[in-house]
Amino acid sequence: CEEGWHCTSEACESCVLHRSCSPGFGVKQIATGVSDTICEPCPVGFFSNVSSAFEKCHPWTSCETKDLVVQQAGTNKTDVVCGPQDRLR
């Protein structure tokens, strides 16, 4: 099969396009010439905001390491939003 496609059976009389993993899912196993993409749900702490046949789930940004705080929680489809810490006057 052509790049981006895989055999539908052992006989390989036909091919189908590799599937992509939807937002909220990441690639667990990249497709080969004889097997399709395997997707997995992004666990807590990880996200994917794209439909992709290659991208794994990405970890949420660590606001603390940037001396920032979480302004908006992350989801399985979105990263956290970091913001400046409120300073006491």
Epitope: S9, E10, A11, E13, S14, S20
Partner: antibody
Framework: EVQLQQSGPELVKPGASVKMSCKAS????????IHWVKQKPGQGLEWIGY????????NYNEKFKGKATLTSDKSSSTAYMELRSLTSEDSAIYYC????????WGQGTTLTVSS | DIVMTQAAPSVIVTPGESVSISCRSS???????????FYWFLQRPGQSPQLLIS???NLASGVPDRFSGSGSGTAFTLRISRVEAEDVGIYYC?????????FGAGTKVELK
Amino acid sequence: EVQLQQSGPELVKPGASVKMSCKASGYTFINYVIHWVKQKPGQGLEWIGYINPYNDDSNYNEKFKGKATLTSDKSSSTAYMELRSLTSEDSAIYYCARDLIGSYWGQGTTLTVSS
Amino acid sequence: DIVMTQAAPSVIVTPGESVSISCRSSKSLLHSNGNTYFYWFLQRPGQSPQLLISRISNLASGVPDRFSGSGSGTAFTLRISRVEAEDVGIYYCMQHLEYPFTFGAGTKVELK
């Protein structure tokens, strides 16, 4: 000669489910996927998804997830599509096709959803 | 989803003359493997769709050479020279590059 024979027309009530069939002949059933395509009256074509009879792997258009379920039966070389929670928007001709971009399509099953 | 746009809903043509039908995609259909996953289908009145042209310009088995396809990337054209009565129907373009596969709204060819 490759043929895809689809089941006859269906008249069903809103809220019900329906299961239509696509019987393949003239080739090795498990070696090709079966795609399903929707055509509303007087309108264009919409890809629903496919079923791979070799391993029962299915792939759906997000729009039809929860609406359509694709299955197959190797012993009878038949692919099936079940549609649930039917509304008037589901009234259409449904085609099965071997490989989609090949030349083999069924004759279509007309589904009418009406009370 | 990739949007396939067929600007002309219908065209009326005199038998024996030529007609061109256009289709645009919202994204390039050229894959990194060098192939362009673009197809033309014809649906004659009361019939199932049938493949006419694959990969922009390759005629399907049994399709007369009065049909030809051209284009690249996002813009494609189907040309029918010497139109005959059997060419009447709705012509659909389709992309096979990404899921979900998508079709154009169709261009109806009628005879004058």
